[in-house]
């Protein structure tokens, strides 16, 4: 969709991982004066929502309240602006935003090798495992907008596991992992218990600004 106006922006508050039965606000905004905003979802159940734009200080926006969260509401969202209503003249679409429902299945376990406290520069690997036959595991770090994902390995000792090599440790952080199944990519398990990774001998434990991730499955992504 080329659109007669440039694309609006789409944000999720408080974030794109939404627990079952909770609500997420998807905010569509632009510095173009759009009278209408349309929010379109692709996924298990497609839908389009419409709101009239609000205008403040040269910004047009619409806050779409999505919830109580359930599987049909998870998917890839894009928002469009329109200056007219009948017919709509749609802008280019916003960048896609994947909204994931969590809390559907049993939580996996998260552990660190060699342990959750490591020396600066030492390599650390986080392992996510479960007796449930998850196809994918997703690792998130508190304060970062994106997760990295790995395919689960074959069943070993009754569990399915994925290892996330974090590389040489420079900064600590609180990590969680989730499991999901191949045919339901937007439907994730309960979160693992949080795992605090501490880096000792580090002059600063402040976080780097999150970098734009590569989202290729199976590519190690450094969340440190």
């Amino acid at each position: 969709h080329e659109g007669v106006h440039r694309k609006p922006s789409l944000l999720a508050h408080p974030g794109r991982l939404v627990k079952s039965e909770e609500t997420v606000i998807l905010q569509c905004w632009s510095d173009v004066r759009f009278e209408h905003f349309l929010l379109h979802r692709e996924g298990k159940f497609k839908d389009t929502l419409h709101l009239i734009g609000e205008h403040h200080d040269g910004v047009s926006k619409a806050n779409f309240s999505i919830g109580p969260m359930m599987q049909d509401l998870a998917g890839t969202y894009r928002c469009y602006g329109s200056v007219t209503h009948s017919p709509y003249q749609l802008s280019a679409p916003s960048d896609p935003l994947d909204i994931v429902i969590t809390g559907l299945y049993e939580k996996p376990s998260l552990s660190a090798q060699p342990g959750p406290t490591v020396l600066a520069g030492e390599s650390v690997t986080l392992s996510c495992s479960s007796r449930s036959s998850y196809d994918m595991y997703h690792l998130s770090r508190e304060g970062e907008a994106h997760e990295c994902r790995f395919s689960a390995g074959p069943k070993v000792n009754g569990t399915f596991q994925a290892d996330f090599p974090l590389g040489p440790a420079t900064h600590g952080g609180t990590y969680r992992c989730f499991g999901s199944f191949r045919d339901s990519p937007y439907e994730w398990s309960n979160s693992s218990d949080p795992l605090l990774v501490s880096v000792t001998g580090n002059p600063s434990n402040s976080w780097p600004s999150p970098t734009e991730p590569s989202s290729k499955t199976g590519n190690p992504r450094h969340l440190h």
């Epitope: 039965e21 349309l38 379109h40 692709e42 298990k44 159940f45 497609k46 839908d47 389009t48 929502l49 419409h50 709101l51 779409f64 309240s65 999505i66 919830g67 109580p68 359930m70 599987q71 049909d72 509401l73 209503h85 009948s86 017919p87 709509y88 749609l90």
Partner: antibody, heavy 124, light 108 residues
């Protein structure tokens, strides 16, 4: 005042197809959620699927997947439901219905406006 | 799919009485995604309640809905002659959207 007006009754042979239309007047058809619901004689209601015309995206109940096609023509504010490989069990009244759309409604699955219904009889 | 079971199948009451219709789901349905309809012979259904408890436009306040999880209720506080019809509950919280089999409300 929004109205949905459906096409007339149809008599079809088993194995054939039927296409029912639903013309909307009033309101903004583009962003409507138009669903199709059927009711066999003396039976309850059954949701078949629906469409939102502006993006042409349709959802179907698994039971009808592959046999039903729901489309919409924005230029004429008309939605269509085509059901193929008809059998006697498809004899029913077919309704189009608009999903309630207010700012606090996130799923347009409660149907506030209905067409008058189209009777489809499948008989050899 | 979510199966909705309505009870009773038939309810015989007199005008002026209170009617209580039940709808039970085979699995939990968020109360935001449950509706009630009234249908008279030869007519299309009419939306009464959405979101389990919100009255649709133009519906008299003698109709009220309540419930959560798997148990939902439609109450008609004082039956009017025009209320005798078939009532359906419907969930739209999980596709495919499904309806109950209906409760027939008849004059005693």
């Amino acid at each position: 005042q929004v109205q949905l007006v459906q096409s007339g009754a149809e008599v079809k042979k088993p194995g054939s197809s039927v296409k029912v239309s639903c013309k909307a007047s009033g309101g903004t058809f583009s962003s409507y959620a138009i669903s199709w619901v059927r009711q066999a004689p003396g039976q309850g209601l059954e949701w078949m699927g629906g469409i939102i015309p502006i993006f042409g995206t349709a959802n179907y109940a698994q039971k009808f997947q592959g046999r039903v096609t729901i489309t919409a023509d924005e230029s004429t504010s008309t939605a269509y439901m085509e059901l193929s490989s008809l059998r006697s069990e498809d004899t029913a009244v077919y309704y189009c219905a608009r999903g309630l759309d207010t700012p606090n409604v996130v799923v347009k699955g409660a149907f506030d406006i209905w067409g008058q219904g189209t009777t489809v009889t499948v008989s050899s | 799919e979510i199966v909705l079971t309505q009870s009773p199948g038939t309810l015989s009451l007199s005008p002026g009485e209170r009617a209580t219709l039940s709808c039970r789901a085979s699995q939990s349905v968020s109360s935001s995604y449950l509706a009630w309809y009234q249908q008279k012979p030869g007519r299309a259904p009419r939306l009464l309640i959405y979101g389990a408890s919100s009255r649709a436009t133009g519906i008299p306040d003698r109709f009220s809905g309540s419930g959560s999880g798997t148990d939902f209720t439609l109450t008609i506080s004082r039956l009017e002659p025009e209320d005798f019809a078939v009532y359906y509950c419907q969930q739209y919280g999980s596709s495919p959207w499904t309806f109950g089999q209906g409760t027939k409300l008849e004059i005693k």
